[in-house]
Interface confidence: low
Amino acid sequence: QDSRGCARWCPQDSSCVNATACRCNPGFSSFSEIITTPMETCDDINECATLSKVSCGKFSDCWNTEGSYDCVCSPGYEPVSGAKTFKNESENTCQDVDECQQNPRLCKSYGTCVNTLGSYTCQCLPGFKLKPEDPKLCTDVNECTSGQNPCHSSTHCLNNVGSYQCRCRPGWQPIPGSPNGPNNTVCEDVDECSSGQHQCDSSTVCFNTVGSYSCRCRPGWKPRHGIPNNQKDTVCEDMTFSTWTPPPGVHSQTLSRFFDKVQDLGRDYKPGLANNTIQSILQALDELLEAPGDLETLPRLQQHCVASHLLDGLEDVLRGLSKNLSNGLLNFSYPAGTELSLEVQKQVDRSVTLRQNQAVMQLDWNQAQKSGDPGPSVVGLVSIPGMGKLLAEAPLVLEPEKQMLLHETHQGLLQDGSPILLSDVISAFLSNNDTQNLSSPVTFTFSHRSVIPRQKVLCVFWEHGQNGCGHWATTGCSTIGTRDTSTICRCTHLSSFAVLMAHYDVQEEDPVLTVIT
């Protein structure tokens, strides 16, 4: 016991009343007001509790302390009086803080600060949105991936910071009146071909495709270096001349000079020169056949091979070149009698007749063009009288059944000598090179030397043999009628043709003749 009458055992946060009792200090409470045993404790009173009589007022918060409490302004508010704490509503001077004025960069980039009671918000600029993990930070909206599909399907969306663009896809352009960039952009395919924006080589023709274009070889041209046709980088070469070279194993300076001219023409060839090139080739051929030079010294079989090679090549070259001619009818003739008649048309539904001095050809235009070929239709006829020198005594090969029948009944035929060439050799060609089986036959009317009485006249064509040479044949050709100096032939295919006179006497009604014709 304290001699001064004060209990020394008072618990924490209490003071003695006398030697036997204690009382809790202000702000603390115990189970009973007077503490009489050291086992009792003084606990802090929470003045801020809901049922407490303490009222701090608006825009403020009550903070409990050990044995007391403080009133403080809520976050986003500050006291006008400057006092950080106060005890009751009457001392409350809290008012809203304008954070936006205090710190203009509060919303960082791309946002505008908006003050609110006790706080602030950030309003993002158009094209931006608040980041979920940082509600004060505005981040770019990717309009292109947000599922809004803001662009027309003819454009592609390009996201920018704060906005986006709808740009025409490569190979497309804005439609008339449309911008290129805003969300109302609408594009259409650029026709690179007609606008001149293509990079097609001059050896090709430009074809527009959706969003792009391709370059196709001109008619009669083929892709060079194995580059595929129909690409942007297709470069073509004129295939007209590429295969027309001297036949192997034939040694002739005259022929070599002719082919040198052909190759020179090929090297300098441009599609616009088709007309001139055709004339130059026929002129060279006419000169060759008028003055065959050392060709005349070749063995006969080699002469036939040369003739076969010239006929075959000429047909291909003329077909290729004529595809680059403009519509119309052409007729050329040369000193030694070589003659060309040629008609070029967009396909028409009628028959065509080509007339020359010694031959007339009549056929259906429908034959001329391969279906799906976009080029013009061409029908051509060349008379080459000079070829007769090289084809002198060329063999006639009949079909086995005709041959057998003739051997049984007319032993003399073809053994007394080769048939005689009565007419000029003519070569017929179309833009369509698939002429082995025409859907309607072609008719030739030949003018020729007089027929020796009682000799058989045959309509024949030159069949190019696999050995590079060839022979006369009758398959697919029939003699419709013959007079002394003219013969009408009908054939179901195209090639080089002539009228032959066979060596044997014709009887009045010879059943074999029917077979031959």
Epitope: C144, C157, R169, P170, G171, Q199, D201, K232
Partner: antibody, heavy 118, light 111 residues
Framework: EVQLVQSGGGLVKPGGSLRLSCVAS????????MNWVRQAPGKGLEWVSS????????YYADSVKGRFTISRDNAKNSLYLQMDSLRAEDTAVYYC???????????WGQGTLVTVSS | QSVLTQPPSVFAAPGEKVTISCSGS????????VSWYQQLPGTAPKLLIY???KRPSGIPDRFSGSKSGTSATLGITGLQTGDEADYYC????????????FGTGTKVTVL
């Protein structure tokens, strides 16, 4: 014959630089969009960058934006990829590839290996 | 990361037919042509199919492609040992800035 011949790959430390080249032949180089595509070891193909025929349009994958630069020299028929600030995850075989606008990668180079390692 | 999904692997015996699917979205397959690439072990990828179903010259007609909506399919008939390779689909993605996206790739194993 279309050919794309690549060079310039090798071993480089993280943060380092490397320049890949691709020389084209057999086609009109200036007419084609050119691209780089890469393939990390044992992984799939990833488009890296593309450059239009006249270099007017250049695009990059997000993973390389700001670090890689694509360029071309039409006079030399050459395509380049300048790779800076390289990271370990850039380790891959890099292919150059020809592409028509809006179309497929129709011809590819033989590939060149880039290894980024310390 | 690829945005076009393919099965990781396909197994089949020689002579059999296999199909590989490629699934995308409206911004890629739904919006453009699909191409397929073949990558033989240790070599660069090679174009196999373009414009959904067209074959470049030199690609046999055993390989075919088709597209429906936002998915595409590569078919290989008469499977040969030489077809053992990784196959990738690819297309232009309009949600990227002129970005091209590839599939995850499918390994075809000939048993």
């Amino acid at each position: 014959e279309v050919q794309l011949v690549q060079s310039g790959g090798g071993l480089v430390k993280p943060g380092g630089s490397l320049r890949l080249s691709c020389v084209a032949s057999g086609f009109i180089f200036r007419s084609y969009s050119m691209n780089w595509v890469r393939q990390a070891p044992g992984k799939g193909l990833e488009w890296v960058s593309s450059i239009s025929s006249s270099s007017s349009y250049i695009y990059y994958a997000d993973s390389v934006k700001g670090r890689f630069t694509i360029s071309r020299d039409n006079a030399k028929n050459s395509l380049y990829l300048q790779m800076d600030s390289l990271r370990a995850e850039d380790t891959a075989v890099y292919y150059c590839a020809r592409r028509e606008y809006g179309g497929p990668f129709d011809y590819w180079g033989q590939g060149t290996l880039v290894t980024v390692s310390s | 990361q690829s945005v076009l999904t393919q099965p990781p692997s396909v197994f089949a015996a020689p002579g059999e037919k296999v199909t590989i699917s490629c699934s995308g979205s409206s911004s890629n397959i739904g919006n453009d042509y699909v191409s397929w690439y073949q990558q033989l072990p240790g070599t660069a990828p090679k174009l196999l199919i373009y414009d959904n179903n067209k074959r470049p010259s030199g690609i046999p007609d055993r390989f075919s492609g088709s597209k429906s909506g936002t998915s595409a399919t590569l078919g290989i008939t008469g499977l040969q040992t030489g077809d053992e390779a990784d196959y990738y689909c690819g297309t232009w993605d309009s949600s990227l800035s002129a970005g091209y996206v590839f599939g995850t790739g499918t390994k075809v194993t000939v048993l």
